[in-house]
């Protein structure tokens, strides 16, 4: 018999499909399962992020049995993908610690605002960045990162939560967006596409990049994520686009080389600590910034997004590994895990550099239409 491409009926993994069914349709996302760039930002398009308060942009919630972390993340609901991927019809044992935010997926039902009303908010993420319309803001100083170069021990948890791959970060990673705007890093995760299909969440003048990394931070003004949700500046995300380059990225390889071990949704492994800052662009001075939301349920607003102008280069093989290794719920490949871009609704994206004149990810006409909102800071 030809092995079906599902673990359930092949030695290759674990889903539930017909006994001798070769590659089942549910193994690959269908067109209607995946967001399309030209789609309007309708509710159905709101594919999201990952697993915490329902969003991969949030730290994962540890089970009660684990030690209480300094950020008390365990007070958040544990959000799992609905049902057991091997037994989709038998999911009564799941979700015990979760809430309705666990029941969402990229594309299709349920519409995200039904999962979390905030997903229908006016100031959502991701957005399309148009550098020529960004407001140059000299007050936006280079980002400051402290403690991001982690020693090999203690090891870090790398988890496939069914929506993304997420690396939980230890206490001590400090980030400042500016004076008095201090944060602690909680976790990082990635968004990607599929073969020949880019999967970044943010776009630049409509251009979608192959992938995107998000490093999620909690303001030092809050002790817990649930306190910060929905509060202006309570959470901050550093985002960078991943592009194809000629060489292997050794920093990313430390994570990508472990993905095969966590191919199954819900599985995790331990990886040696690494230099987290090496996963980001080297230029911390040139970036775009705006206030938006988590990109998955609960879609809480008030999130400060900082999107680097410089991209990170990965080899073609590395990008393929990222998009072709992991599996999500219901025995479907974990691919195209990005939300459609959302309307700005009057928001102005600020730039720490004169982006209208020199916008790197995508060149644009040198027009500066918006003024810096923080000019007086």
């Amino acid at each position: 018999q030809r092995l079906p491409r599902m673990q359930e009926d092949s030695p290759l993994g674990g889903g539930s499909s017909g006994e001798d069914d070769p590659l089942g349709e549910e193994d690959l996302p269908s067109e209607e399962d995946s967001p399309r760039e030209e789609d309007p930002p309708g509710e159905e398009d709101l594919p999201g992020e990952e697993d915490l308060p329902g969003e991969e942009d949030l730290p994962e919630v540890k089970p009660k049995s684990e030690e209480e972390g300094s950020l008390k993340l365990e007070d958040l609901p544990t959000v799992e993908a609905p049902g057991d991927p091997q037994e989709p019809q038998n999911n009564a044992h799941r979700d015990k610690e979760g809430d309705d935010q666990s029941h969402w997926r990229y594309g299709g039902d349920p519409p995200w605002p039904r999962v979390s009303p905030a997903c229908a908010g006016r100031f959502q993420s991701p957005v399309d960045i148009r550098p020529q319309l960004a407001a140059f803001c000299p007050a936006l100083r280079p980002l400051e990162l402290l403690g991001f170069q982690l020693p090999p021990l203690p090891e870090l948890r790398l988890r496939n939560n069914g929506h993304s791959v997420q690396l939980t970060l230890p206490p001590g990673l400090e980030m400042a967006l500016g004076p008095g705007r201090e944060y602690r890093a909680l976790q990082l995760h990635l968004h990607w596409g599929a073969a020949g299909r880019p999967g970044s969440e943010h776009t630049v003048e409509g251009h979608r990049f192959p992938a995107e990394i998000h490093v999620v931070h909690l303001s030092t003004a809050f002790a817990r994520v649930d306190e910060a949700l929905g509060r202006p500046g309570g959470l901050a995300v550093l985002a960078a686009f991943l592009e194809e380059g000629p060489e292997e990225n050794s920093a990313y390889e430390q994570l990508l080389s472990r993905l095969e071990e966590i191919a199954e949704e819900g599985s995790e492994t331990q990886v040696p600590g690494l230099d987290i800052s090496a996963l980001l662009p080297s230029d911390f001075s040139r970036y775009f910034q705006y206030e938006g939301s988590l990109t998955t349920p609960p879609c809480a607003q008030g999130v400060i997004w900082t999107v680097f102008n410089q991209t990170v280069m990965l080899s073609a093989k590395q990008l393929h590994t990222l998009s072709d290794t992991l599996w999500g719920p219901g025995d479907s490949r974990l691919q195209l895990n990005f939300r459609a871009t959302q309307p700005l609704n009057g928001r102005v994206i600020e730039a720490s550099f004169p982006a209208g004149v020199d916008s790197s990810p995508r060149a644009a006409e040198p027009v500066q239409l918006n003024s810096c909102l923080a000019a007086g800071d």
């Epitope: 092995l3 359930e8 092949s10 993994g13 193994d27 057991d84 599985s267």
Partner: antibody, heavy 118, light 112 residues
Framework: RVQLVESGGGLVQPGGSLRLSCAAS????????MNWVRQAPGKGLEWVSY????????YYADSVKGRFTISRDSAKNSLYLQMNSLRDEDTAVYYC???????????WGQGTTVTVSS | DIVMTQTPLSSPVTLGQPASISCRAS???????????LSWLQQRPGQPPRLLIY???NRFSGVPDRFSGSGAGTDFTLKISRVEAEDVGVYYC?????????FGGGTKVEIK
């Protein structure tokens, strides 16, 4: 740590029965397909049986079909191999091994020895 | 059943020198999904097998980069760029494209 530990091997007469167990720890057992692989003394590896994560799909090597039964109890994080009508040629070290989506078997137990002899 | 044939049966190698093992399948290992589910395992004396390479050429985590896999269709090769003492053991190719899963007969790598 991710670990598989086999038990239940021993000396048995031809025609007899044995039940092997494999205790899994350090990973979400219920999410992975599992295999039994054996190795006769001084010989190579021979795949014996496969069971999918939810037990809905099971395969056996022709050499054991009708005599061996693979099963699992995810609540107990355990894999089993019930071996009946044992033959001399079933003498081997029996390993349980975890399957990856890539087709590779990434976690192996230390093995348990089954000796069929009169 | 797919028969996996490995050559050579034994490969005496000088420390620091390269080694190469071949594996031939009786039929193509390309799955209908486009992937080729050919892996390589190492079994050191007295130890259980250990996964080295999956899907022809992907090194499993923790495997030294001196190990590399290549090939396509029915013919595959495992190469060790510079053999070290800890590489002594038996190497097996294995196909997981079709049930029953089958292993090659093994190639013994030993130091001259």
């Amino acid at each position: 740590r991710v670990q598989l530990v086999e038990s239940g091997g021993g000396l048995v007469q031809p025609g007899g029965s044995l039940r092997l167990s494999c205790a899994a720890s350090g990973f979400t057992f219920s999410r992975y397909s599992m295999n039994w692989v054996r190795q006769a003394p001084g010989k190579g590896l021979e795949w014996v049986s496969y069971i999918s994560s939810s037990s809905s799909t099971i395969y056996y090597a022709d050499s054991v079909k009708g005599r061996f039964t693979i099963s699992r109890d995810s609540a107990k994080n355990s894999l089993y191999l019930q071996m009946n009508s044992l033959r001399d040629e079933d003498t081997a070290v029996y390993y349980c091994a975890r399957s990856l989506r890539s087709g590779g078997m990434d976690v192996w137990g230390q093995g348990t020895t089954v000796t069929v002899s009169s | 059943d797919i028969v996996m044939t490995q050559t050579p049966l034994s490969s005496p190698v000088t420390l620091g020198q390269p080694a190469s093992i071949s594996c031939r399948a009786s039929q193509s290992l390309v799955h209908s999904d486009g992937n080729t589910y050919l892996s390589w395992l190492q079994q050191r004396p007295g130890q259980p097998p250990r996964l080295l390479i999956y899907k022809i050429s992907n090194r499993f985590s923790g495997v030294p980069d001196r190990f590399s896999g290549s090939g396509a269709g029915t013919d595959f090769t495992l190469k060790i760029s510079r053999v070290e003492a800890e590489d002594v053991g038996v190497y097996y190719c294995m196909q997981a494209t079709q049930f029953p899963l089958t292993f090659g007969g093994g190639t013994k790598v030993e130091i001259k």
